[in-house]
Each structure stands twice: as structure tokens, then as C-alpha cells.
């Protein structure tokens, strides 16, 4: 169990105690329960009240981060007297031995890299373990192929991402002979961590008066459809002076990804290319390969 | 230009199945997200289910679990509905349409709708 | 009844500027899911005007706009004309359903 909790209560106890792996706080079932309400406070006095559960006597958290420390309350009134009990769960370990600088993303549609450093004051023979949990199913998965520097894991890859949901738990766990290792957790939304895939099969077809550049969405992790997407076309004609403004160009997507602009014969070579983001968050792909069109003596 | 084209009118009796259709031209269907949506007077808009990539297949609305049906063939970019035991209170427009946006599902381009009579 | 809530009529004379307000819970628009829009002419399917709360597909004029705020969102026509008289619906997703839910829709009726 990553961390000590220390109970602060009255002299009849409601036994109250928490599961991290299900974030599931219960206590004992009292008789003749009138009322009962669960919350956790955090350090910066954030208040998060979950539903009860149908018993009345647990709660789940659904969305908390627990790595600064918080203290879990239980109210329960009965029909014969009152009842209030703090649960107080500290990030137990030296200071500054979690792990630091976390961050992961998704990449290629199906895979994932999550990096860390090691803490400021971990002792040399530290380790450190990731564990996801998805928002849906509570699953549980254990970092598979770990990046190593002397030793240390400092980040993870993941190329199965079937068991994550839209928001998932990132927890990474530190343990050492000499000390104790602090935790460090973390929630991430898979949307904003996906680096999108340029867009492929890009082409260019001219006539006389006009070109039209066709393109196919990426694939991506999430599931995203053609309105999902918004598309930047950069039209660069070649040879010009360094420092001229390169044509960047918005287009929102469609079920038919397309650019139709006016050039007309002779057109002096040209390149195009495009990048894609996701429309609500603008987090833009690399640049898909140039393709060249026109001719060196348009 | 993607078009949706769906079957005529049809007049059942109570207790009878219907199957509407809707044809996509201009686009294959393999690569969209197809759902049903009908109309009527009295209740507006009703959402009867669709293709949901999130669970890889297809979902109904809750109350219409074990009547509707909705199928695809992706051959000749076809896909149907079919609704069974009829009622008189599902006289209604069915439209099929394509979701453009899975963000709150937005419903880009849609057929014209099938005109269902239910009466004795 | 429809999960979502709108005015069921709005007018308002050419050149003007008309609203239309589409109430939701926290299992819809305050889940927060995106919200759609869309205008239906007599007789015909509906087209849609919005998605992503207040994103316009090519072709509907920026006359056309909307905005999300907690569990309600709303619609507005800049400029009234004469073939805006419609029937307009919001639709979102809604969890609890786990599925598409609409307004019961607003008729925009022009002076």
C-alpha cells in the first residue's frame, strides 16, 4: 500500500478506511442510518463529494488526484446520535523522492510513451512503476516495456492501448531500501495527449485555371470523425526570396477532404503541404511530406 | 457530393415489421457512422441508435431495445432499418443520417425520410 | 417530453436579431458534451447549422452563431430574413440515455 493512514476519531469509530485501487472509502454500516455523506479535502481546500453507493456506507471517487495529500471525512447520523470521522492520507515518503516532470502521449494512433525524471532527493537506488487505471472498467495496467537511464525506469511505452477509456489515472510508484519513496498520480484526457499523424495520400491535380489538393484524414486513437478535425495547408511557391510569407491556409473537415485555389497556366512550381488537428484543441500534426507542382519555368 | 437515398413510403398494420432503407452514394459506407432518427408530430426527434466507434458497434436507444434492428451492407453501401411490432404511435418520418462529429454526435448529411403509417 | 428544453416559438422583424435558448442537465450539455443545431425547413430533412457548440459548417452564413454556457446553450440569427422561418432543434448527447437527445424545437416565425 503506497501510503500510511492515520485516523482522526471520536471514541466509537465508524472504522473508516480507503482502498486506493478502487478509490472506494467505506466504513462500518451503522443501524438506523438517517444520514450520511462522504467528502475528501485536498491541500488546496478543493471539496470533491461523490454520490453514496446504495448501501450508504462507501462512497467511490471517481476523478482524484492524491499525490499532495487529503483528508477523507465520513458524516453518519443515526436515529439515536451522530457520528464524524477524518481519515487523513499523507503522501508518505522523504519530500521530492517522487517521481517528477510527468507527462505522456500517444502517438501513431496506437501507441504510447509516458517519461518521468527521478525526484531531486531519491536515493540512488531508486525505482519507479507506472500503473494506468481507465475511468470505465477500474482495469488495471501494469507498465510493459519500461525506458531505463542507469538503471532507473524513467518512462514507459505502451503499444496496447485497448484498455484505456477517454480519461485515465496515471500512478507512478517509487520504492528504495534505504527510504521511503513518495507516489506521484496524475489524470489525463487521451485527447489532449494524442500527436496526431500528418494527413495522408495527399495529391494535387491541375488545370488550367485551378489546382485542387485532396487529402485523407489521419487515424487516430480516439475515435474522431471528418467535423472533428480541422486541416492547415501551407502553399509555398519555390524560389522566392528568404523571408517571404508562406500561404497558410485553414480548412475545417469535411467528408470530402478538399482545397480548391485559382493558378493558372503557366504556374511557376509550387509545393504544398498539410498538417491536421484535433478542431477543439489545435494541437497540430507535423507537416505531411511537400508535394511539389507546377514548373521551375512557369 | 454524398447523398443518402432512402425507400418509399410504406403502410403497415399494427403488430407488422417495417424495413426502411438508406443508400449512400458519392462515399463509402465502411468508412461512415450511420444512425436513425425519426419524427413525429407529437414527440419531435426521436434518436433510435446507430454505429458507435466507441464500443465498435452498433447501440439502440433504451426504448426501443428488442424491437429495432439496424443492419449494413457495406457491398452495395446499404444500410436498414427494421422495426417490429408496430404500434399506431410509430407513424412517423424515419431519417437516416451520418455522423459528422462524434463530439455530441452531429448529424451532417441525412436522407430524405421514409414516410411509416401505422393503422389498421 | 423532450430532454432538451427550448422556447417553442421566437419572431422577430427582417434585420433583426432573434435568440433561442436550449436547456440541458449534467448529463447532457453540463456533462459537457458538444451541442448541435439544426434548422428544418417545411417539409424537407433537417440541415445542420452548428457543431462544437458554436461551429459552423462550410456554407451556413456567420449570421448563424451559438455558445455553451454550463447546462444550457443558445442560438442566435443576426440579420433575420425571410427564409430563416424554420423549425430549429439543439441536440446533444446524453449519458444517462447513452444516446442523442434533442429539443422539442423553436419556430422562428419573421414579421
Known amino acids: 500500500e503506497k501510503s500510511d493512514l492515520r485516523t482522526v476519531a471520536p471514541a466509537s469509530s465508524l472504522n473508516v478506511r480507503f482502498d486506493s485501487r478502487t478509490m472506494n472509502l467505506s466504513w462500518d454500516c451503522q443501524e438506523n442510518t438517517t444520514f450520511s455523506k462522504c467528502f475528501l479535502t485536498d491541500k488546496k481546500n478543493r471539496v470533491v463529494e461523490p454520490r453514496l453507493s446504495n448501501n450508504e456506507c462507501s462512497c467511490t471517487f471517481r476523478e482524484i488526484c492524491l499525490h499532495e495529500g487529503v483528508t477523507f471525512e465520513v458524516h453518519v447520523n443515526t436515529s439515536q446520535r451522530g457520528f464524524q470521522q477524518k481519515l487523513l492520507y499523507p503522501n508518505s515518503g522523504r519530500e521530492g523522492t517522487a517521481a517528477q516532470n510527468f507527462s505522456c502521449f500517444i502517438y501513431n494512433a496506437d501507441l504510447m510513451n509516458c517519461t518521468w525524471a527521478r525526484g531531486p532527493t531519491a536515493p540512488r537506488d531508486v525505482q519507479y512503476f507506472l500503473y494506468i487505471r481507465n475511468s470505465k472498467r477500474r482495469r488495471e495496467i501494469r507498465c510493459p516495456y519500461y525506458i531505463q537511464d542507469s538503471g532507473t525506469h524513467v518512462g514507459c511505452h505502451l503499444d496496447n492501448l485497448s484498455g484505456l477509456t477517454s480519461r485515465n489515472y496515471f500512478l507512478v510508484n517509487g520504492t528504495s531500501r534505504e527510504i521511503g519513496i513518495q507516489f506521484f498520480d496524475s489524470l489525463l484526457d487521451t485527447k489532449k495527449i494524442e500527436r496526431f499523424n500528418p494527413p495522408s495520400n495527399v495529391t494535387v491535380r491541375c488545370n488550367t485555371t485551378h489546382c485542387l489538393v485532396r487529402w485523407k484524414q489521419p487515424r487516430t486513437y480516439q475515435k474522431l470523425s471528418y467535423l472533428d478535425f480541422q486541416y492547415q495547408l501551407d502553399v509555398h511557391r519555390k524560389n522566392t526570396q528568404p523571408g517571404t510569407e508562406n500561404l497558410l491556409i485553414n480548412v475545417s473537415g469535411d467528408l470530402e477532404n478538399r482545397y480548391n485555389f485559382p493558378s493558372s497556366e503557366p504556374r511557376a512550381k509550387h509545393s504544398v503541404k498539410i498538417r491536421a488537428a484535433d478542431v477543439r484543441i489545435l494541437n497540430w500534426s507535423s507537416w505531411s511530406e511537400a508535394i511539389e507542382f507546377g514548373s521551375d519555368d512557369g | 457530393q454524398v447523398q443518402l437515398v432512402q425507400s418509399g413510403a410504406e403502410v403497415k398494420k399494427p403488430g407488422a415489421s417495417v424495413k426502411v432503407s438508406c443508400k449512400i452514394s458519392?462515399?463509402?459506407?465502411?468508412?461512415?457512422?450511420i444512425h436513425w432518427v425519426r419524427q413525429t408530430p407529437t414527440k419531435g426527434f426521436e434518436w433510435m441508435g446507430g454505429f458507435d466507434p466507441e464500443e465498435n458497434e452498433i447501440v439502440y436507444a433504451q426504448r426501443f431495445q428488442g424491437r429495432v434492428t439496424m443492419t449494413e451492407d457495406t457491398s452495395i453501401d446499404t444500410a436498414y432499418l427494421t422495426l417490429s411490432s408496430l404500434r399506431s404511435d410509430d407513424t412517423a418520418v424515419y431519417y437516416c443520417?451520418?455522423?459528422?462529429?462524434?463530439?455530441?454526435?452531429?448529424?451532417?448529411?441525412w436522407g430524405k425520410g421514409t414516410m411509416v403509417t401505422v393503422s389498421s | 417530453q423532450a430532454v432538451l428544453t427550448q422556447p417553442s416559438s421566437v419572431s422577430g422583424a427582417p434585420g433583426q436579431r432573434v435568440t433561442i435558448s436550449c436547456t440541458g442537465s449534467g448529463s447532457n450539455i453540463g456533462a459537457p458534451y458538444d451541442v448541435s443545431w439544426y434548422q428544418q425547413l417545411p417539409g424537407t430533412a433537417p440541415k445542420l447549422l452548428i457543431y462544437h457548440n458554436n461551429k459552423r459548417p462550410s456554407g451556413v452564413p456567420d449570421r448563424f452563431s451559438a455558445s455553451k454556457s454550463g447546462t444550457s446553450a443558445s442560438l442566435a440569427i443576426t440579420g433575420l430574413q425571410a427564409d430563416d422561418e424554420a423549425d430549429y432543434y439543439c441536440?446533444?448527447?446524453?449519458?444517462?440515455?447513452?444516446?442523442?437527445?434533442f429539443g422539442g424545437g423553436t419556430k422562428v416565425t419573421v414579421l
Open positions: 458519392g462515399h463509402s459506407l465502411s468508412e461512415l457512422s
Open positions: 443520417s451520418i455522423v459528422g462529429s462524434f463530439s455530441g454526435w452531429a448529424f451532417d448529411y
Open positions: 441536440q446533444s448527447y446524453d449519458s444517462s440515455l447513452s444516446g442523442s437527445v
